[in-house]
Interface confidence: medium
């Protein structure tokens, strides 16, 4: 469970306008539990197919987890008067497969959004920015939790999932104030090149349990506030000099690298040298080689340059296609 949110039909302003009355400040939607004292509304595991229209105006924490929302339309949480207090919205595990542009518009205080565990076949580029302008009004979001939002293979669009998520993160430069971004367990093969440049306020970035093979084209240079970078459980083979220098240059960062299949050949020499002197990597004594076979389970910190060789290229007569 986490903080949650409220939404409406695809004609959000009509809901309360129909009766020409704003919702009563203390009413509680059917199938929900409400606490005005805690400013919390919970509509959890109720198989809701849309966001209740009659959410109380006091709601600060809204939980809509474990439902069957399917689509979050534009203005899903827009109300008249607006839900001005809503700060934390949790939509995790609600079978969302489509989040449309402007879905979170008219939520001026929304600081935390959790869309985890939804198989998002479509995430609009304007889901968080709310408009297709090249520079949008800043989003109030500070924490964005997008763990395990990758759809099953048969539901994927033709475009790359990484690209779709990246487009939503950078659109309109709306997320310049984002402090925390969790993108764990999304089968990411790569991190699109310009994403991090558009998120300069990031303090916590979780990319664990993906399939990242390389960080060669990723720049961390402008993430001067970054405090924690989680890269555990990926497919990283080596970190090259450019990446090492950028990480070392970040004043507050802690990097987590456990459980990657490090390849301990001649290309690993710079990383091993760096590991021995850096204070940036947490638990660096636990990092071990996965390849080549002769190096398996060797501790990276215990290696020296003599251990890190590359097999010479086979002569043409011995090469196989």
């Amino acid at each position: 469970t986490s903080s949650a949110s409220s939404s409406s039909s695809s004609a959000p302003f009509l809901a309360s306008a129909a009766s020409a009355q704003p919702p009563l400040p203390d009413q509680c939607p059917a199938l929900c539990e409400c606490s005005e004292a805690a400013r919390t509304v919970k509509c959890v595991n109720r198989n809701l197919t849309e966001v209740p229209t009659d959410l109380p105006l006091y709601v600060r924490n809204l939980f809509l987890t474990g439902n069957q929302l399917a689509v979050l339309p534009a203005g899903a949480f827009a109300r008249r008067p607006p839900l001005a207090e809503l700060a934390a919205l949790n939509l995790s595990g609600s079978r969302l497969d489509e989040v449309r542009g402007g879905a979170f518009e008219h939520l001026p205080s929304l600081r935390q959004l959790d869309l985890s565990h939804n198989p998002l076949a479509y995430l609009s580029p304007f889901a968080f920015s709310g408009s297709n302008a090249s520079i949008s009004a800043p989003s109030p979001l500070v924490e964005l939790i997008l763990n395990h939002i990758v759809p099953p293979d048969d539901k994927r669009q033709n475009r790359s999932f990484e690209g779709m998520v990246a487009a939503a993160l950078v659109a309109g430069r709306a997320l310049q104030g984002l402090h925390l971004l969790e993108l764990a367990s999304n089968h990411f093969l790569y991190l699109p090149r310009d994403v991090l440049a558009q998120l300069p306020s990031l303090r916590y970035l979780d990319l664990s349990n993906n399939s990242l093979v390389s960080l060669t084209y990723v720049s961390f240079r402008n993430l001067t506030h970054l405090e924690s970078l989680h890269l555990e459980d990926n497919a990283l083979k080596v970190l090259h000099n450019g990446t090492l220098a950028e990480l070392q240059g970040l004043p507050h960062v802690r990097v987590f690298l456990d459980n990657n299949p490090w390849v301990c050949d001649c290309h690993m020499a710079d990383m091993v040298t760096w590991l021995k002197q850096t204070g940036v990597v947490q638990g660096k004594d636990r990092l071990t080689c996965a390849f080549p076979e002769k190096m398996r389970n060797r501790v990276l910190l215990e290696l020296n340059s003599a251990d890190l060789d590359c097999d010479p290229i086979l002569p043409p007569s011995l090469q196989t296609s």
Partner: antibody, heavy 121, light 107 residues
């Protein structure tokens, strides 16, 4: 309904070993990080160890590092804690707990009932 | 490691009282703090997560606040069933440490 059921506790001599198990049901086990927390008699809670959903990443309190090993079998929906070189100060009730959330937005939302480990000669 | 210090270590209050327990971190932990309640012989129970979010099923008389290093758990109107030990826990650090606990007794 989420359920966590610990087993494997008992009396063991100093220097001995014990393996605790935690059988999970009612949720998709592999999607959640899990943890062990212990409580010595009359004392407070002490975080012992945690493991990621895949089992690939493990974390240990300094007091148990090198002696305890956390692991999981996602096909059996079971969490384990292998405890070696046990000491008198490891005597405690050991709880398994489920983590909800990410690395930071993380909290233990379900706990088992605990299993008592007594280390004594 | 990040140290968590709770105060007071114990307190006694009457039914209907407003009770406040504080938790201080040895370094900034943003809002990554949880509160648990434990009754004798029972497993801990999650009350508040992420500093201020109330866990499902927890009475609304419980609330949490704070950010950075200083956090507060408040019980707005103490009930007899609130007699228990309360623990804070940080999840910012690599190791998710608990405070030493605050034992709350009903007068």
């Amino acid at each position: 309904e989420v359920q966590l059921l610990e087993s494997g506790g008992g009396l063991v001599q100093p220097g001995g070993s014990l393996r605790l198990s935690c059988a999970a049901s009612g949720f998709t086990f592999s999607s959640y990080a899990m943890s062990w927390v212990r409580q010595a008699p009359g004392k407070g809670l002490e975080w012992v160890s945690a493991i990621s959903g895949s089992g690939g990443s493990t974390y240990y309190a300094d007091s148990v590092k090198g002696r305890f090993t956390i692991s999981r079998d996602n096909s059996k929906n079971t969490l384990y804690l292998q405890m070696n070189s046990l000491r008198a100060e490891d005597t405690a009730v050991y709880y398994c707990a489920r983590y909800y959330g990410g690395y930071y937005s993380a909290w233990m939302d379900y706990w088992g009932q605990g299993t008592l480990v007594t280390v004594s000669s | 490691d990040i140290q968590m210090t709770q105060s007071p270590s114990s307190l006694s209050a009457s039914v209907g009282d407003r009770v406040t327990i504080t938790c201080r971190a040895s370094q900034s932990i943003s809002s990554f703090l949880n509160w648990y309640q434990q009754k004798p012989g029972k497993a801990p129970k999650l009350l508040i997560y992420a500093a201020s979010s109330l866990q499902s099923g927890v009475p609304s008389r419980f609330s949490g606040s704070g950010s950075g290093t200083d956090f507060t758990l408040t019980i707005s109107s103490l009930q007899p069933e609130d007699s228990a030990t309360y623990y804070c826990q940080q999840t910012y650090g690599y190791l998710h440490t608990f405070g030493q606990g605050t034992k709350l007794e009903i007068k």
